[in-house]
């Protein structure tokens, strides 16, 4: 068990803060909830603190919850591949470039670390080149979320990881908006981190609303499990 992994044995409170600017539309989002890495479970509620969110909530899911991949469930035989927990409590910088097919792109930078007993994800987001009547600024996405696989590889040069995945957003007309994600994670601290073999995270997300919440918001339930590395031969002969 890495030193960082010991911090995730129980339920951990989560705080998310985002400052965004998409095509000049500025906004802020605050999120609160909790994570339980034993089950790879996240429950979070996000509120746009600046009024109406200028982009559809589903386009921010990866920035919020795929931001705290330290809550992913890594099975026992894969724990030595869990970069995310090993970087704690100092945390990691997580950066992404996200291209929305035939539309604009997001660039994000987040610092994910413990502040006291709380896991905090502080994010800056910049969106450019979006069409005002496109699927994103035109709010044509359905309020739901598909399951995805998130592919992880070591980046020894940066003492971190590179990640790639393609998100499929459902559009109201029945078609799909693709979003290509390019991600890099680097540790904030100088301590040793686990550099993984290639593997993936399997994610399932459910979006809902709080019937008592008047502000523009999103409620998110997510399960994330690491996979893609089989038991070694030594496991077979135990």
């Amino acid at each position: 068990m890495s030193k960082g992994e010991e911090l995730f044995t129980g339920v951990v409170p989560i705080l998310v803060e985002l400052d965004g600017d998409v095509n000049g539309h500025k906004f802020s989002v605050s999120g609160e909830g909790e994570g339980d890495a034993t089950y790879g479970k996240l429950t979070l509620k996000f509120i746009c603190t600046t009024g109406k969110l200028p982009v559809p909530w589903p386009t921010l899911v990866t920035t919020f919850s795929y931001g705290v991949q330290c809550f992913s469930r890594y099975p026992d035989h894969m724990k030595q591949h869990d970069f995310f927990k090993s970087a704690m409590p100092e945390g990691y910088v997580q950066e992404r470039t996200i291209f929305f097919k035939d539309d604009g792109n997001y660039k994000t930078r987040a610092e994910v670390k413990f502040e006291g007993d709380t896991l905090v994800n502080r994010i800056e987001l910049k969106g450019i080149d979006f069409k005002e009547d496109g699927n994103i600024l035109g709010h044509k996405l359905e309020y739901n979320y598909n399951s995805h696989n998130v592919y992880i590889m070591a980046d020894k040069q940066k003492n971190g990881i590179k990640v790639n995945f393609k998100i499929r957003h459902n559009i109201e007309d029945g078609s799909v908006q693709l979003a290509d994600h390019y991600q890099q994670n680097t540790p904030i601290g100088d301590g040793p981190v686990l550099l993984p073999d290639n593997h993936y995270l399997s994610t399932q997300s459910a979006l809902s609303k709080d019937p008592n919440e008047k502000r523009d918001h999103m409620v998110l339930l997510e399960f994330v499990t690491a996979a893609g590395i089989t038991h070694g031969m030594d496991e077979l002969y135990k």
Partner: antibody, heavy 120, light 106 residues
Framework: EVQLVESGGGLVQPGGSLRLSCAAS????????IHWVRQAPGKGLEWVAS????????SYADSVKGRFTISADTSKNTAYLQMNSLRAEDTAVYYC?????????????WGQGTLVTVSS | DIQMTQSPSSLSASVGDRVTITCRAS??????VAWYQQKPGKAPKLLIY???SLYSGVPSRFSGSRSGTDFTLTISSLQPEDFATYYC????????FGQGTKVEIK
């Protein structure tokens, strides 16, 4: 050893076309972004276009959008810049450069450059 | 587009001098700023990335810092091989470069 080698530059008339190539060695372009940056004679650096070959995601400077197309062939580990409807103001040395996947990476390796001259 | 206003456009200095070049972004660019050195007829070379991270193999006399939307490249003790043109570059929006600063021998 990481290397980027540009080719395809030359003299072309206004309205004409050229295709620049950027052959990469010593690394797999799929796991990086590739950028074209140009420098007009005696002037500063100007970004032209970028491609993320893993998913073929692209972006362009406003000055070339609709005229230039960036592409990549991962099997050949090569990026391309197709330049159409060339103008006199496109005259420059064109460099290809490698960067990481994210905004803070910086362009850590550059080619030697290839000169494009647009003149009648 | 995000503008990077670089100053000064040129400066004269002597070997051993401390040299400071600044870039101001027209809006927030997070830490997505890099600095390059270019010599005549050559391709640019990366010095600093992520506003303040020294690129591998670059001498430690080069450093970068950020204060909001102001970014600074400092050469603590100018060496003969440092006379060149320096550019800042942001990649938070569509990529843009500063106009360049030519460092000449006094």
């Amino acid at each position: 050893e990481v290397q980027l080698v540009e080719s395809g530059g030359g003299l072309v008339q206004p309205g004409g076309s050229l295709r620049l190539s950027c052959a990469a060695s010593g690394f797999n372009i799929s796991y990086y972004s590739i950028h074209w940056v140009r420098q007009a004679p005696g002037k500063g650096l100007e970004w032209v276009a970028s491609i993320y070959p893993y998913y073929s995601s692209t972006s362009y400077a406003d000055s070339v959008k609709g005229r230039f197309t960036i592409s990549a062939d991962t099997s050949k580990n090569t990026a391309y810049l197709q330049m159409n409807s060339l103008r006199a103001e496109d005259t420059a040395v064109y460099y290809c450069a490698r960067a990481g996947w994210v905004a803070s990476s910086g362009m850590d390796y550059w080619g030697q450059g290839t000169l494009v001259t647009v003149s009648s | 587009d995000i503008q990077m206003t670089q100053s000064p456009s040129s400066l004269s200095a002597s070997v051993g001098d401390r040299v400071t070049i600044t870039c101001r972004a027209s809006q927030s660019v997070s830490s997505a700023v890099a600095w390059y050195q270019q010599k005549p007829g050559k391709a640019p070379k990366l010095l600093i990335y992520s506003a303040s991270s020294l690129y591998s193999g670059v001498p430690s006399r080069f450093s970068g810092s950020r204060s909001g939307t102001d970014f600074t490249l400092t050469i603590s003790s100018l060496q003969p091989e440092d006379f060149a043109t320096y550019y800042c570059q942001q990649s938070w929006g569509l990529i843009t470069f500063g106009q360049g600063t030519k460092v000449e021998i006094k």
